[in-house]
């Protein structure tokens, strides 16, 4: 297709000059452009008391182009609209209005919500999560050995974050009690001693019901060595308490 377009030329005025500026096809010294070259829009510009014809490559903001056989005109968008393809198809609304299907609305229709960033009415988006991933190995304080009760965790991903009015996401982490596989810990695999063995607080995302109580995790089947460790721990705890009490009385 060729870029050139046919336009019926307007009848020549007595004061029409041949050396037209810019995109003018015909013009006069007094009125400026009288007609435009193909693909250009004719608009009137007010200069003082006088209106001058100008030819524009595109219509200014707030106006849209209309084609006629002999002229292309710029026409104003509706009052509530900043940019448009025509009066019935707005593409950007003025401040305080929301765009929906080419119209500018004060409030969004039922079932839609206002996006204050894009100033559009958008569909309410509900949270979507993936299927659960497999359960993690059963561990007790990071160890997968030692004939103890432990915990296992599984996670799932958020596929679609919800919009402001959408349904919130369900938990994405789940932890439950389990039995650590029955095998003796190798050297260096034993649990840490003393205060270091205190359980880390669970993450916010973990479901309460699935978070195990540290007491209930203690297994009745213990190796003598581990029982000794426990007694030492108890002693240390008592000592620690006494220390903290004595410290607190200083204040």
């Amino acid at each position: 297709q060729n870029a050139s377009r046919g336009r019926r030329q307007r009848r020549m005025h007595p004061n029409v000059s041949q050396g037209c500026q810019g995109g003018c096809a015909t013009c006069s010294d007094y009125n400026g452009c009288l007609s435009c070259k193909p693909r250009l829009f004719f608009a009137l510009e007010r200069i003082g008391m006088k209106q001058i014809g100008v030819c524009l490559s595109s219509c200014p903001s707030g106006y849209y182009g209309t084609r006629y056989p002999d002229i292309n005109k710029c026409t104003k968008c509706k009052a509530d609209c900043d940019t448009c393809f025509n009066k019935n198809f707005c593409t950007k609304c003025k401040s305080g209005f929301y765009l929906h299907l080419g119209k500018c609305l004060d409030n969004c229709p039922e079932g839609l919500e206002a996006n204050n960033h894009t100033m559009e009415c958008v569909s309410i988006v509900h949270c979507e999560v993936s299927e659960w991933n497999p359960w993690s190995p059963c561990t007790k304080k990071g160890k997968t050995c030692g004939f103890k009760r432990g915990t296992e965790t599984r996670v799932r991903e958020i596929i679609q974050h919800p919009s402001a009015k959408g349904n919130l996401c369900p938990p994405t982490n789940e932890t439950r009690k389990c039995t650590v596989q029955r095998k003796k810990c190798q050297k260096g695999e034993r649990g840490k001693k003393g205060r270091e063995r205190k359980r880390k607080k669970p993450n916010k995302g973990e479901s309460k019901e699935a978070i195990p109580d540290s007491k209930s995790l203690e297994s009745s089947k213990e190796i003598p060595e581990q029982r000794e460790n426990k007694q030492q721990q108890k002693k240390r705890k008592v000592q620690d308490k006494q220390k903290s009490v004595s410290v607190s009385t200083v204040h």
Partner: antibody, heavy 117, light 111 residues
């Protein structure tokens, strides 16, 4: 002479994304909005949406709203249309077109997209 | 959405005869005295080509045997006389409202 030259044919698997380009020449790229229209095999024409190259503002047919993104690069006078989460029904010829005073007056040659597993 | 119903779906016309294609909109596509209806011609393997804009205006470079008429909801594309090169599919398209929509097309063949 106004010309819109589109990128070559694409074959994609369901769930994947595709990005089609449309390079404009012969006019000032920022003067007119660029629209995208598709045509499934043996079917009619379906409007996808538009972009204003001057400021990057875009608008989409509600049907495609959550899957389509239109962008542009004014330095190369190129418009892009990205369609995500592809399904077999997206198999079609995708056209870009300039929109001049409420009609599509210049069209790209089309980009064939085949979505198949 | 504005639905455009084209009829007939296909049409066989003898060379030199008149071909008439109609397009009915589900609601008016007029505003401020302008009709936002366009007609396109598409040949196999090619993009569509603008024939008529604003219901009745002939696009530059298009032969005068093509003409458009109508307003509101009822529009007509006429080809008179039909020539061999006119074998194609013809689409009406409204640009009055979002989303822009096309008719399903009318396939013109020679008898």
């Amino acid at each position: 002479q106004v010309q819109l030259v589109q990128s070559g044919a694409e074959v994609k698997k369901p769930g994947a994304s595709v990005k089609v380009s449309c390079k404009a020449s012969g006019y000032t790229f920022t003067d007119y909005s660029i629209h995208w229209v598709r045509q499934a095999p043996g079917q009619g024409l379906e409007w996808i949406g538009y972009i204003y190259p001057s400021n990057g503002d875009s608008g989409y047919n509600q049907k495609f709203k959550n899957r389509v993104t239109m962008t542009r690069d004014t330095s190369t006078s190129t418009a892009y249309m990205e369609l995500s989460r592809l399904r077999s029904e997206d198999t079609a010829v995708y056209y870009c077109a300039t929109y001049f005073a409420n009609n599509f007056d210049y069209w790209g040659q089309g980009t064939t997209l085949t979505v198949s597993s | 959405d504005i639905v455009l119903t084209q009829s007939p779906a296909s049409l066989a016309v003898s060379l030199g005869q008149r071909a008439t294609i109609t397009c009915k909109a589900s609601q008016s596509v007029d505003y401020d005295g302008d009709s936002y209806m366009n007609w396109y011609q598409q040949k196999p393997g090619q993009p569509p080509k603008l024939l008529i804009y604003a219901a009745s205006n002939l696009e530059s470079g298009i032969p005068a045997r093509f003409s458009g008429s109508g307003s509101g909801t009822d529009f007509t594309l006429t080809i008179n006389p039909v020539e061999a090169e006119d074998v194609a599919t013809y689409y009406c398209q409204q640009s009055n409202e979002d989303p822009l929509t096309f008719g399903a097309g009318t396939k013109l063949e020679l008898k």
